[in-house]
Amino acid sequence: HAPEDPSDLLQHVKFQSSNFENILTWDSGPEGTPDTVYSIEYKTYGERDWVAKKGCQRITRKSCNLTVETGNLTELYYARVTAVSAGGRSATKMTDRFSSLQHTTLKPPDVTCISKVRSIQMIVHPTPTPIRAGDGHRLTLEDIFHDLFYHLELQVNRTYQMHLGGKQREYEFFGLTPDTEFLGTIMICVPTWAKESAPYMCRVKTLPDRTWT
């Protein structure tokens, strides 16, 4: 028979999305046991029928990768989990409406920091996503967010930071002291979607000035 409260078997059904990798996760409820099995279905907002996710039927793990199934940036999606206990009790819970554009979080960018004598160069590499374009290429975050920019900061000492920002991929902090260590942080920002990545950090030392030796 169905339990009085579905949360006895199943809790916190939600999408966790990072750089457009969309993972459905959930927790077992207080009456869940290790042999409780879970089956996952998904649907596009506006569609009537649910689709069973292959590879996520009668599983015991508490996550399911729905990246491919929820890969259309312009669509909204739902997913639901049905838990069935060893004793035959079942419960179903559905996610809130999911938009990958709105809900995905941004990972730190991939950056190369290059030391020079009186400057530090930072080259940001475009961040790939699992989403494929019509030509088969993987889209980058830059392909998806028109307003994406990079915010770069160089900690010079405890009280002074230098800042750069832009939509370019190559930056250089000039006027630095040779043979000195600096901490750089680089973030991806998308103001129109209120997104800000965790920072990439690089600790770099300017090269010694050999011209006086």
């Epitope: 940036l73 989403i131 374009a133 290429h137 998806i144 028109h146 920002g165 370019q168 103001p191």
Partner: antibody, heavy 117, light 107 residues
């Protein structure tokens, strides 16, 4: 050398349609943000629409939403602007432009669109 | 939408004059502000980006300053070839918006 060449402008009656084209060369067209910008006679500049040629993601200024459609043919390195339900206030020179290395620094020479009865 | 208010709409300058044009945004745009020059019958030419960074090949008499909501373009000594219209552009968020322009004429 980056080159952008617009075509397709002309005189059209209110309510009519036009399709503008922009032939691009000298850069990687298939992974870029491409823009249509217009300038009404004696007036300022206005961004009309933008498309990412790889993802197909588009944005429009509010005044043309539902009437204009931006698109590309990546095989032919060509940007389009389909303009329907044209109004007299759409009269302008229409430029295509592109963002390269983060900067909007390359523009075509423009094509004149005149909406008049 | 972010509205860019540019002033003055026109100005008369003598050759060698120092000219300042200002642009104000209705919300903070950090340093995502570019300045373009446009001559009659020509396409806009990028002069300054990132509020203060001079585009390659642009003479050093042009300079830009500002961040947040207030920005200025300065021509330290106007030359004949600088007589043109100047537009600011916010590149922070779509729709990208220009100021209404400043026409620099000879006094």
């Amino acid at each position: 050398e980056v080159q952008l060449v617009e075509s397709g402008g002309g005189l059209v009656q209110p309510g009519g349609s036009l399709r503008l084209s922009c032939a691009a060369s000298g850069f990687t067209f298939s992974s870029s943000w491409m823009y249509w910008v217009r300038q009404a006679p004696g007036k300022g500049l206005e961004f009309v629409s933008v498309i990412n040629t790889r993802s197909g993601i588009t944005h429009y200024v509010e005044s043309v939403k539902g009437r204009f459609t931006i698109s590309t043919d990546n095989a032919k390195n060509t940007l389009f602007l389909q303009m329907n339900s044209l109004k007299s206030e759409d009269t302008a020179v229409y430029y295509c432009a592109t963002r390269i290395q983060g900067l909007i620094d390359y523009w075509g020479q423009g094509t004149q669109v005149t909406v008049s009865s | 939408d972010i509205v860019m208010t540019q002033s003055p709409s026109s100005l008369s300058a003598s050759l060698g004059d120092r000219v300042t044009i200002t642009c104000q945004a209705t919300q903070s745009i950090s340093t995502f502000l570019s300045w373009y020059q446009q001559k009659p019958g020509q396409t806009p030419k990028l002069l300054v980006y990132g509020a203060s960074r001079l585009q390659t090949g642009v003479p050093s008499r042009f300079s830009g300053t500002g961040s947040g909501t207030k920005f200025t373009l300065t021509i330290s000594g106007v030359e004949a070839e600088d007589l043109a219209s100047y537009f600011c552009l916010q590149d922070y968020s779509w729709p990208l918006t220009f100021g209404q322009g400043t026409k620099v004429e000879l006094k």
